[in-house]
């Protein structure tokens, strides 16, 4: 079938990075500068994307693949092809429909994007809170209360049970 197809359509022999040039007897010509063809058998090459303004070049255009953009620092991409840039929030915030909002008590976000996540519930693992959580950081769980009974070797006392920032029980 492939042989039949190539006999019928000489363009099918043109590999990625070339185009089937009708002006030159359907010879496979290389894509001109700033253009590419990612599949074989194409009759034209596509113009390379230019990453301008808020968009930065993540991957240069080649004869077989388009350029890829990302966003300038302080912004992150929206969509598979990074067609828009959206402002990052700060750590300790999440982007809501109303913009960047601080994480609610009992939740944290240690990144500049994504959502606030609940603090780890240490007691579910039979552990106690060693370091209280904040908007930016999860709680740090320590040894279980049983491990801290008299004679146990731990030197770090558990945090008081009702202190602000304590993981919800």
């Amino acid at each position: 079938f492939e042989r039949t197809r190539s006999l019928q359509d000489p363009c099918s022999n043109c590999p990625a990075g070339t185009f089937c040039d009708n002006n030159r007897n359907q010879i496979c010509s290389p894509c001109p500068p700033n253009s590419f063809s990612s599949a074989g058998g194409q009759r034209t090459c596509d113009i390379c994307r230019q990453c301008k303004g808020v968009f930065r070049t993540r991957k240069e255009c080649s004869s077989t693949s388009n350029a890829e953009c990302d966003c300038t620092p302080g912004f992150h991409c929206l969509g598979a092809g990074c067609s828009m840039c959206e402002q990052d929030c700060k750590q300790g915030q999440e982007l809501t429909k109303k913009g960047c909002k601080d994480c609610c008590f009992g939740t944290f976000n240690d990144q500049k994007r994504g959502i606030c996540r609940p603090w780890t519930n240490c007691s579910l693992d039979g552990k106690s809170v060693l370091v209280n959580g904040t908007k930016e950081r999860d709680v740090v769980c320590g040894p279980s209360p049983a491990d801290l009974s008299p004679g146990a070797s731990s030197v770090t006392p558990p945090a008081p049970a009702r202190e602000p920032g304590h993981s919800p029980q």
């Epitope: 301008k52 808020v54 929206l78 067609s83 959206e86």
Partner: antibody, heavy 116, light 107 residues
């Protein structure tokens, strides 16, 4: 806060040129493309073109390609749009706007009236 | 060029009404669709970007949906300050193009 402030209204004669300025503040001017959009009285919005202040590279709407020139001066965070060979149907409000893939901040607009 | 067709071109509604404006692109624009609100004598203001993301400070009664070629702006409960003209705009390809606008008037 991020702001775009445009030059004042202009009355110009047919055949003449007009140059509208757009001064940016509150952000890194060179880091964002500036686009220009116009709106004739009682009409909708029409995209004219864009400039990348960092490189001076431009993209123009074919409709204006031979009459429009967009420039930018990064030292004073200002973009310019010059339209030549003005006709009466160029009477419009001209807006500059910052691009993130969407136009998040707009200038207040500059009314250009073409009249003899 | 990608043509953007908005409907209706105008509508009359009352405070509290649910209002829906549609925008159709002449070819696939994925989710690269933005909505703007404009009041007389003022510059347009961004409402929604990337089809459904609310710009900061925009009330949650505004929402957007769709993908490909068909998109919708919905105002769940119209408020007096929402009487304005609304424009859709595609960012898929240059030239950037706008819909013709939908004027929302008081009934």
């Amino acid at each position: 806060q991020v702001q775009l402030v445009q030059s004042g209204a202009e009355v110009v004669k047919p055949g003449a040129s007009v140059k509208v300025s757009c001064k940016a503040s509150g952000y890194t001017f060179a880091g964002f493309e500036m686009h220009w959009v116009r709106q004739a009285p009682g009409q909708g919005l029409g995209w004219m073109g864009a400039i990348d202040p960092k490189t001076g590279g431009t993209d123009y709407n074919q409709k204006f390609k031979d009459r429009v020139t967009m420039t930018a001066d990064t030292s004073i965070s200002t973009a310019y749009m010059e339209l030549s060979r003005l006709r009466s149907d160029d009477t419009a409000v001209y807006y500059c706007t910052r691009d993130l893939g969407y136009f998040d901040v707009w200038g207040q607009g500059t009314l250009v009236t073409v009249s003899s | 060029d990608i043509q953007m067709t908005q409907s209706p071109s105008s509508l009359s509604a009352s405070v509290g009404d649910r209002v829906t404006i549609t925008c159709r692109a002449s070819q696939d624009i994925r989710s690269n669709l933005n909505w703007y609100q404009q009041k007389p004598g003022k510059a347009p203001k961004l409402l929604i970007y990337y089809t459904s993301r609310l710009h900061s400070g925009v009330p949650s009664r505004f929402s957007g949906s769709g993908s490909g070629t068909d998109f919708t702006l919905t105002i769940s409960s119209l408020q007096p300050e929402d009487f304005a003209t609304y424009y859709c705009q595609q960012s898929e390809k240059l030239p950037r193009t706008f819909g013709g606008g939908t004027k929302v008037e008081i009934r």
